[in-house]
């Protein structure tokens, strides 16, 4: 029972410009019925999976990926992909996370929302097993 899967979306809370040491949560969204969401970092070389999916609306699922204490090394491009049996979706647009030194002064700019688009690439369908591993040839490293 094949169906066309809509591309997921990605956002960040409270935004995409995060002070060093603060927290950020990436929110991935897709259709109802998603089994696994994956947050990929910089061309799929590292990723985190979750099957802890919840409803975002009557027509959407979501998953949340939290980084408790942002480091400079967390800056970069992130995107989402999901698995709804029997296949993977395309990737979302990229979201760029910027990490700034926390000056803490009254003139510090507020955290800004925003995103930057990037290319998408479909993973090979035969790369999937029940636990949604990385595509073949990639090391299963964690984002944080």
């Amino acid at each position: 029972q094949e169906e066309d899967l809509p591309r997921p979306s990605i956002s960040a809370e409270p935004g995409t410009v995060i002070p060093l040491g603060s927290h950020v949560t990436f929110v991935c969204r897709g259709p109802v019925g998603v089994q696994t969401f994956r947050l990929e970092r910089d061309s799929r070389s590292t990723y985190n999976d979750t099957e802890d999916v919840s409803q975002a609306s009557p027509s959407e699922s979501e998953a949340r990926f939290r980084i408790d204490s942002v480091r400079e090394g967390n800056a970069g491009l992130y995107r989402c992909i999901y698995y709804k049996p029997p296949k993977w979706s395309e990737q979302s647009d990229y979201l760029e996370l910027l990490v700034k030194e926390s000056s803490g002064g009254p003139d510090s700019p507020d955290t800004e929302p925003g995103s930057s688009a990037g290319p998408t690439q479909r993973p090979s369908d035969n790369s999937h097993n029940e636990h949604a591993p990385a595509s073949q040839g990639l090391k299963a490293e964690h984002l944080y």
Epitope: E51, D52, P58, S59
Partner: antibody, heavy 117, light 107 residues
Framework: EVQLVESGGGLVQPKGSLKLSCAAS????????MNWVRQAPGKGLEWVAR??????????YYADSVKDRFTISRDDSESMVYLQMNNLKTEDTAMYYC????????WGQGTLVTVSA | DIQMTQSPASQSASLGESVTITCLAS??????LAWYQQKPGKSPQLLIY???SLADGVPSRFSGSGSGTKFSFKISSLQAEDFVSYYC?????????FGAGTKLELK
């Protein structure tokens, strides 16, 4: 192979306590939400409790019928989920199933809890 | 809480026939609905998720339809092993409520 094995059921008196355990294997336990569902003899299914993963701060949810009496918890290092049941009532008599994730694809075989004087 | 009203409570049918079970949600749940089969003495088995998607390994004679508040579950060409109990469940919001069940009986 995904396995969910419940244990800890038995006979207990009204107002008594019991702790159920569910041992999970064959999947990435720590990224899944886990649930308990029960079924009284000859009756339908009733969702009891749910615990989310670390990425969702181990949030817990309960059916109104068990709120303030039952507590769901988990140990990711041991791939275990628990249901602590206090102040048990005769209407809590049921088969208790451990169930994985949001869409209830995987169920354990169940453990029977009988509350009777 | 969202109530799930499942009907009929029981239904008699013959081998090879088709049957339809309905489930009504007390408020809109989009397509956050699942259908389960339960054989006597066994754990339930997921058949349909997201209202219309067939779970892995489930025969294509099972199907689901609907969205919002009204949902249907159909078994076409009943086989001997299909004469068991079926439940709907909403997963839109906690508590994750089930319908009361439908028992299929051989006519």
């Amino acid at each position: 192979e995904v396995q969910l094995v419940e244990s800890g059921g038995g006979l207990v008196q009204p107002k008594g306590s019991l702790k159920l355990s569910c041992a999970a294997s064959g999947f990435s336990f720590n990224i899944n939400a886990m649930n308990w569902v029960r079924q009284a003899p000859g009756k339908g299914l009733e969702w009891v409790a749910r615990i989310r993963s670390k990425s969702n701060n181990y949030e817990t949810y309960y059916a109104d019928s068990v709120k303030d009496r039952f507590t769901i918890s988990r140990d990711d290092s041991e791939s275990m989920v628990y249901l602590q049941m206090n102040n048990l009532k005769t209407e809590d008599t049921a088969m208790y199933y451990c169930v994985r994730s949001l869409w209830f694809v995987y169920w354990g075989q169940g453990t029977l809890v009988t509350v009777s004087a | 809480d969202i109530q799930m009203t499942q009907s009929p409570a029981s239904q008699s049918a013959s081998l090879g026939e088709s049957v339809t079970i309905t489930c009504l949600a007390s408020q809109t749940i989009g397509t956050w609905l699942a259908w389960y089969q339960q054989k006597p003495g066994k754990s339930p088995q997921l058949l349909i998720y997201a209202a219309t998607s067939l779970a892995d390994g489930v025969p294509s004679r099972f199907s689901g339809s609907g969205s919002g508040t009204k949902f249907s579950f159909k078994i076409s060409s009943l086989q001997a092993e299909d004469f068991v109990s079926y439940y709907c469940q909403q997963l839109y919001s906690t508590p994750l409520t089930f319908g009361a069940g439908t028992k299929l009986e051989l006519k």
